[in-house]
């Protein structure tokens, strides 16, 4: 096959980005300001370590984990990190003009920065449906759009359905989910031949994508519990996700190799289905009123994870053009409803248990926030889909997708590969 | 017992500033978080802020925001109110106010939250 | 910012019972706003009387009973006394952030 020289994004990029944080730093500059009232310092120490987990997930987690392609591994890792230092910038000024502008100035605390890095978070969940097709420039967008919608979705939930921080922004899974598949559906679907080897995993990237995974399931309690607003409740939400992601782990594994004639582990099933528990307990990981209860809601995540890993590639591949160890965003979409489900069964309990006549009510509240954020995901996912589309955007020829070689200087290679 | 203290109040010209302090005992401090309500002269209760156990993170009524600032020392079992730009409308006694979390939920662990318990108060008075 | 209704005054006579609530100015309370209600007579602090729409709280005679009516908190007094006059506040939490007080009821009790 002749050589197709990548697009080349290099006026496109750095003006686009560039221009980008120039504005952001200006928005930064008139219209934030630090927190200074922190007395206690022991506080303030024990705020950020929170921060720090969910950075270590974003960074580390979610880039390493989505690394698994044969020749993306280099794209993977540094795109996220980029997307994250992008989203994170983004979604404080967002949520600080959302919920506290009315003041003049957005205060920027240690809880702002955890809220933002948590809304970043949902992009690197969305993105898995989408590297290796897009260039960086698509990726900015896809940041833009998404945090936005997402600090909307949260803003419009909060004042329409009256949730806390924790229930509106555990959305997130089923948000990011069908966001990144609606954005899939949009981009250019099929491989061209002598391509599919690109989309392939290999050992020494599974072996880092193993490293993410490990670092989310480290890390899923203190996502879980970041937003909690009570000691009690961050004490609940920690134990019922450690339960659930130590379940869902042994659930993987053992289902994984259940799962193939010969017995063997699929290292694509372990790396997303060892998260399962984590994604399916977060809506309710603070609800749920003992351990066993957690561990039988891993045991079933893990399962779904690993059925979905075995049985949806096929149609994903199909229908959205997602590789097939691209598995998070339907991952995320079933267990994400799962989660959901499971709070509005708890829900009807307590509600059935107090005896005052409002199960419906409740009911219909918490299916019409889950119905808002499916909505609003799919709307602007489709939207961010189209604009990505855009030609000016020079998106990569579809025999580069899935190749660092298109945006890394790799100076042992032969120039012009 | 529990108790809640507030102490800082006085006579203050608009513009100027002023700090309460709430002083918390008899139980512990660092893991509720607390609220500041104030009642101007034959007015109602106005909620004025509150601030999260480990102070991570606050919240503010519209009529206060950008120019109060509630704070908390958790080694000092100490509450704050720092009140710059100061108000005629501002006058009002400022009581100090326990936020209790209860568990709501029969089956599940679900809890809610109210004030459970409020200090004297101390008045504040800003007048030219 | 979200307000929060209560009737200004009400009256009621000795051992009757009255009702008072606490509504939106946009919208239906439910148990999702933790509706609490309080009692404040003059010169004191507020007194707890019901939190979580309708638990006591400790000490707080079992005359006064909290619910949800249609789309509104209630408060009722059943067999109210001379002592129960005082002003009655209802109060809101608003989701992710601040906290809304009604206007409150001054009740007389004739």
């Known amino acids: 096959m002749s050589s197709k020289y990548p697009r080349s994004v290099r006026r496109c990029l750095p003006l686009w980005a560039l221009t980008l944080e120039a504005a952001l730093i200006l928005l930064f500059y008139f219209f934030t300001h630090y927190d200074a009232s922190l007395e206690d310092q022991k506080g303030l120490v024990a705020s950020y370590q929170v921060g720090q987990d969910l950075t270590v997930m974003a960074a580390i987690g979610l880039g390493f984990l989505t690394s698994s392609f044969r020749r993306h591994s280099w794209s993977s890792v540094a795109f996220n990190l980029f997307m994250l230092a992008l989203g994170v910038q983004w979604a404080i000024l967002l949520d600080g003009f959302l919920s506290q502008f009315p003041s003049g100035k957005v205060v920027i605390t240690l809880f702002s920065i955890r809220l933002a890095t948590m809304s970043a978070l949902s992009v690197l969940i969305s993105v898995d449906a989408v590297l290796g097709k897009v260039n960086l420039a698509q990726l900015v967008v896809m940041v833009l759009v998404e945090v936005t919608a997402l600090g909307n979705l949260r803003m419009v939930i909060s004042n329409i359905f009256n949730t806390d921080y924790h229930m509106n922004m555990m959305h997130i899974y089923v948000f990011a989910a069908y966001f990144g598949l609606s954005v899939a559906w949009c981009l250019p679907k099929p491989l061209p031949e002598g391509t599919e080897d690109k989309d392939q995993t290999a050992t020494i990237p599974s072996l880092s994508a193993m490293l993410g995974a490990l670092f989310l399931w480290m890390f899923w309690p203190s996502f879980n519990s970041a937003l909690l607003r009570s000691p009690i409740e961050r004490k609940n939400a920690v134990f019922n996700t450690y339960y659930a992601v130590a379940v869902s782990v042994v659930t993987a594994i053992s289902g994984s190799s259940l799962a193939h004639p010969q017995g063997k582990i699929s290292k694509t099933y372990v790396h997303s289905a060892v998260l399962a528990g984590g994604v399916a307990v977060g809506t309710s990981c603070h609800l749920i009123p003992s351990p066993w209860l957690a561990m039988v809601l891993g045991l079933v995540a893990g399962l779904i994870s690993v059925g979905g890993a075995k049985y949806l590639p096929g149609c994903c591949n199909r229908v959205l053009g997602i590789p097939h160890s691209s598995i998070m965003g339907y991952n995320f979409s079933l267990l994400g409803l799962l989660g959901e489900i499971i709070y509005i069964v708890l829900l009807v309990l307590d509600t059935v248990g107090a005896g005052n006549g409002m199960i419906g009510f409740q009911v219909l509240l918490s299916i019409g926030e889950l119905s808002l954020a499916i909505v609003i995901a799919l709307m602007s996912g489709l939207l961010t889909g189209l604009l990505l589309n855009l030609k000016i955007w020079k998106a990569p020829h579809e025999a580069k997708y899935f190749d660092d070689q298109v945006f890394w200087k790799f100076p042992h290679l032969a120039v012009g590969f | 017992q529990v108790q809640l203290v507030e102490s800082g109040g006085g006579v203050v010209q608009p513009g100027r500033s002023l700090r309460l302090s709430c002083a918390a005992s008899?139980?512990?401090?660092?893991?509720?978080?607390m609220h500041w309500v104030r009642q101007a002269p034959g007015k109602g209760l106005e909620w004025v802020a509150v601030i999260w156990y480990d102070g991570s993170n606050k919240y503010y009524a519209d009529s206060v925001k950008g120019r109060f600032t509630i704070s908390r020392d958790n080694s000092k079992n100490t509450l704050y109110l720092q009140m710059n730009s100061l108000r005629a409308e501002d006058t009002a006694v400022y009581y100090c106010?326990?936020?209790?979390?209860?568990?709501?939920?029969?089956?599940?662990?679900?809890?809610?939250?109210?004030?459970?318990?409020w200090g004297k108060g101390t008045t504040v008075t800003v007048s030219s | 910012q979200t307000v929060v209704t209560q009737e200004p005054s009400f009256s009621v006579s000795p051992g009757g019972t009255v009702t008072l609530t606490c509504g939106l100015s946009s919208g239906s309370v439910s148990a999702r706003y933790y509706p609490s209600w309080y009692q404040q007579t003059p010169g004191q602090p507020p007194r707890t009387l019901i939190h979580s729409t309708n638990t006591r709280s400790s000490g707080v005679p079992d005359r006064f009973s909290g619910s949800i009516l249609g789309n509104k908190a209630a408060l009722t007094i059943t067999g109210a006394q001379a002592d129960d006059e005082s002003d009655y506040y209802c109060?809101?939490?608003?989701?992710?952030?601040?906290?809304?007080f009604g206007g409150g009821t001054k009740l007389t009790v004739l």
């Open positions: 106010a326990r936020e209790f979390y209860t568990r709501s939920g029969l089956w599940s662990q679900g809890y809610s939250y109210y004030m459970d318990v």
């Open positions: 008899g139980f512990t401090f660092s893991s509720y978080g």
């Open positions: 109060v809101l939490y608003m989701g992710s952030g601040p906290w809304v």
